[in-house]
């Protein structure tokens, strides 16, 4: 279920969820539907200061790189 994740524990969880894709601490600019003027919220704020779930963690994974064509 949802839980708070801080420090190295949060990094470990992100590495597990995102794997080789890597992850962002902040959502890239223009990510999602939030207003441009809204303060930037990062994974720390969303998962250390309140409970978050797997879906929330996945939002901070870097996008999959397209496979190179042969």
């Amino acid at each position: 279920g949802p839980e708070t994740l801080c420090g190295a524990e949060l990094v470990d969880a992100l590495q597990f969820v995102c794997g080789d894709r890597g992850f962002y601490f902040n959502k890239p600019t223009g990510y999602g539907s939030s207003s441009r003027r809204a303060p930037q919220t990062g994974i720390v704020d969303e998962c250390c200061f309140r409970s978050c779930d797997l879906r929330r963690l996945e939002m901070y994974c870097a996008p999959l790189k397209p496979a190179k064509s042969a």
Epitope: T4, C6, F25, P39, T41, D45, C48, R50
Partner: antibody
């Protein structure tokens, strides 16, 4: 058990930059979140900002333009710089740690460093 | 003016129960962000008293308890003792400010 110790000049002139260092013992600086908080004389606590060693930072919007936080993992230290200080920046400055076992609560604090801004 | 509102002072006689409230809004406590409570004696650093709304760190007596409901939180102290006389601060995260926020603090006086 993580322990924190603030150090730096106790007196800073107006318009200059306040610099403080927090030395961490008993734990790795790369494992936790680190924070600075201040308390003006006779007043309440004010959050200055926090950061993770990877470079993730978050500063109080009211201080953001003047604040820089950095980390030296080799010395297990992190620092605070506050530029263009005025008398309103006179306060006890605390470094604190969020170890992750307390749901974001700051569970370890330094003893505080008193900084006076005066010419 | 603090984002989290606390009464400036509260008092009680030894053995009594007192509560200290912390009122926020929909961008902090009401948004599901955890509330933490700190105890501070004069001339010393704050100490974490309650974390994650209602959890006590080891070493904190069970006379101290925390709760949260809607946009506010409360710290309750039962069996009040003289050594409980201190300042108490609540803290949470505010999404509209994108940062942590403290209450203005409540000074607890134990009548005696």
């Amino acid at each position: 058990q993580v322990q924190l110790q603030e150090s730096g000049p106790g007196l800073v002139k107006p318009s200059e930059t306040l610099s403080l260092t927090c030395t961490v013992s008993g734990g790795s600086i790369s494992s936790y979140y680190w924070s600075w908080i201040r308390q003006p004389p006779g007043r309440g606590l004010e959050w200055i900002g926090y950061f993770f060693y990877s470079g993730y930072t978050n500063y109080n919007p009211s201080l953001k333009s003047r604040v820089t936080m950095s980390v030296d993992t080799s010395k297990n230290q992190f620092s605070l710089k506050l530029s263009s200080v005025t008398a309103a920046d006179t306060a006890v400055y605390y470094c604190a740690c969020i170890t992750g076992t307390t749901k974001g609560g700051m569970d370890v604090w330094g003893q505080g460093a008193t900084v006076t801004v005066s010419s | 003016q603090s984002v989290l509102t606390q009464a400036p002072s509260v008092s009680g006689a030894p053995g009594q129960r007192v509560t200290i409230s912390c009122t926020g809004r929909s961008s902090n406590i009401g948004a599901g962000y955890d509330v933490h409570w700190y105890q501070q004696f004069p001339g010393t650093a704050p100490k974490l008293l309650i974390y994650g709304n209602s959890n006590r760190p080891s070493g904190v007596p069970d006379r101290f308890s925390g709760s949260k409901s809607g946009t506010s939180a409360s710290l309750a102290i039962t069996g009040l003792q003289a050594e409980d006389e201190a300042d108490y601060y609540c803290q949470s995260y505010d999404s509209s400010l994108s940062g942590s926020v403290f209450g203005g603090g409540t000074k607890l006086t134990v009548l005696g």
